[in-house]
């Protein structure tokens, strides 16, 4: 199809090296509100275009996304070319920062409903461009938390340095929908609720004496519980001793809970004592069996292949850490009689 | 309860504060302390809100930007001060409680009587 | 500011019947509306939440719907005492939930 007829916009993400970092497209076709609206473009030079609004905000879950290669080539379908570009409804997902993200994006409704051919599309020229050290050393992060039950802030990652009164008029969206009301470079979140977890894109416009162009960035944010105040506690094992069958195989499972931190370094280990001796066992991998929002539930087992007499004298340890403190949890392999 | 005071009758060009005084409650976080008005046969209009919590967060409807302030002066009172009154300002005044995440009003005062006129 | 569009602005309906109110934002608050029920001389009294849920001691007979930008506010088996303006209300402003535009509001008679 023919995409000269497309309403262009040009877009720049600057990319933090440190982090990584997500982008999105939207498919911003004209709706009926907006005073921008597609037209027919197989009219003569000498016919005025008819003005057709085109279609409402809802029915843009059926769009088509293409990259117009630099070599003139035809148009190339997002989904089938580029796997980490990801489609969803009418916003397009970059997965992975790079320069070799930067092009044009153009979409258009899969469905042209009307027997013409609608130029009814939008091409996006996006530059992407690493952030220089020049840039502002403690810009805020691509991945923001907010507490739950607090006041708290989501800042502009490409405008945290401003203060308030130099920042430009910010445009931000929550889930890709337009948060009209919030024009400033940091979302004040007076109580903080679930609600408020989400993908927030916030742009500005930035100019030259050329031309101008969307500065964007995508912030992911997350809200969390405050740190636990608890060492992790053991809920399995519960015993200190265990009936065991000599020559038998054995699994030994330690449980612990672990409280949420927002730096995140559980230890579970097992480790063997022997009269004077200790040393740690080789085990399998620790796996969460449960995460929820405030907790996590960790486990480890340790493998015996066959119980022998010797295991009978050994303590076995489950050794369990955050950044609160340890507990442990010892058992006694006790063999079971007749 | 919420009770309303201050509503007068003033002439146009006044200034007038109204005030809100809370019982058996204390402004605190996931509240919204507002002001809604009522002119004579009309509508419900909102005015503004002010957030009890730590960010004390403002808002305003866009007519009554820079006209309209409101301010929490105390754990139980609010107040909204009122410049440059016009007879359009005419109306019953009503002090309401926003709440939690549902962000309704579930409180109301029985509202304070403002009449502008010459 | 989020514009709320009421209609009709009086409706009329005998005992027993049904009234449907009809709210349109001017765009998308999802499910954060409230409606109001106000009896002259009086402050209005909160009747559903969250576009559909019904606050504590409201009948069943009162029913909200929708989401987006298109509500409704449904009154079945209508009452003597259901005479009275029906407001909705936008309850989210940005991504804070402060109360915010009201309609119009609707006049329900009830013969």
């Known amino acids: 199809f023919n995409i000269s007829g497309c309403s262009t916009k040009k877009l720049l993400w600057t990319y933090s090296t440190r982090s990584e970092e997500e982008f999105v497209l939207f498919c911003d076709l004209p709706e009926p509100q907006k005073s921008h609206f597609c037209h027919r473009n197989r009219l003569s030079p000498k016919q005025v275009p008819e003005h057709l609004p085109f279609m409402g905000s809802n029915d843009l879950s059926d769009v088509q996304w293409y990259q117009q290669p630099s070599n003139g080539d035809p148009l190339e379908d997002i989904r089938k070319s580029y796997p980490h570009i990801i489609q969803d409804k009418c916003t397009l997902h970059f997965l992975t920062p790079g320069v070799n993200n930067s092009g044009s994006y153009i979409c258009r409704p899969k469905m042209i409903k009307s027997p013409y051919d609608v130029a009814c599309c939008v091409k996006m020229i996006l530059e992407v461009k690493p952030q220089t050290n020049a840039s502002c050393e403690y810009s805020a992060s691509h991945k923001q938390d907010l507490l739950l039950g607090s006041t708290g802030s989501i800042s502009c990652p490409s405008l945290s340095c401003q203060s308030d009164a130099q920042s430009p008029a910010v445009t931000w969206y929550k889930n890709g929908k337009l948060l009209s009301v919030e024009r400033s470079n940091r979302i004040v979140v007076d109580e903080v609720y679930d609600y408020h977890q989400g993908t927030y894109v916030c742009d500005y416009t930035q100019s030259d004496t050329v031309s101008s162009w969307t500065v964007r960035a995508v912030v992911q944010v997350r809200t969390i519980v405050g740190d636990t105040k608890l060492k992790p506690d053991i809920l399995d094992p519960v015993e200190d001793t265990l009936e065991v069958e000599l020559g038998k195989p054995l699994t030994i499972s330690c449980k612990a809970r672990f409280g949420f931190e927002r730096v995140f370094n559980p230890v579970i280990k097992w480790y063997i004592k022997d009269s004077d001796l200790e040393w740690e066992v080789s085990v399998p991998e620790a796996k969460s069996i449960k995460s929820t929002l405030k907790d996590e539930i960790i486990e480890r087992n340790i493998i015996l292949e066959k119980v022998t007499q010797r295991d009978l004298r050994r303590k076995f340890v489950c050794f369990v850490q955050n950044s609160i403190g340890n507990t442990t949890q010892s058992v006694q392999l006790k063999e079971k009689r007749g | 309860s919420l009770e309303e005071s201050g509503g007068d009758l003033v002439k146009p060009g006044a200034s007038l504060t109204l005030t809100c005084t809370a019982s058996g409650f204390s402004f605190s976080s996931s509240y919204y302390m507002c002001w809604v008005r009522q002119a004579p046969g009309k509508g419900l209009e909102w005015i503004a809100c002010?957030?009890?919590?730590?960010?004390?967060?403002t808002y305003y409807a866009s007519w009554a930007k820079g006209r309209f302030t409101i301010s929490k002066t105390s754990s139980t009172t609010v107040t909204l001060q009122m410049t440059s009154l016009t007879a359009a300002d005419t109306a019953t005044y009503f002090c309401?409680?926003?709440?939690?995440?549902?962000?309704?009003?579930?409180?109301w005062g029985p509202g304070t009587l403002v009449t502008v006129s010459s | 500011d989020v514009v709320m569009t009421q209609t009709p602005a009086s409706v009329s309906a005998a005992v027993g019947g049904t009234v449907t109110i009809k709210c349109q934002a001017s765009?998308?608050?999802?499910?954060?509306l409230a409606w109001y029920q106000q009896k002259p001389g009086q402050p209005p009294k909160l009747l559903i939440y969250?576009?559909?849920t019904l606050a504590s001691g409201v009948p069943s007979r009162f029913k909200g719907s929708g989401s987006g930008t298109q509500f409704t506010l449904t009154i079945s088996d209508l009452e003597c005492a259901d005479a009275a303006t029906y407001y909705c209300?936008?309850?989210?402003?940005?991504?804070?939930?402060?109360?915010?535009?009201f309609g119009g509001g609707t006049e329900v008679v009830v013969k």
């Open positions: 209300q936008c309850t989210i402003y940005g991504v804070n939930f402060v109360p915010n535009a």
């Open positions: 765009e998308d608050i999802e499910s954060y």
């Open positions: 309401a409680r926003g709440a939690g995440s549902n962000g309704d009003f579930n409180l």
């Open positions: 002010i957030y009890a919590g730590s960010s004390g967060s």
């Open positions: 969250r576009a559909s």
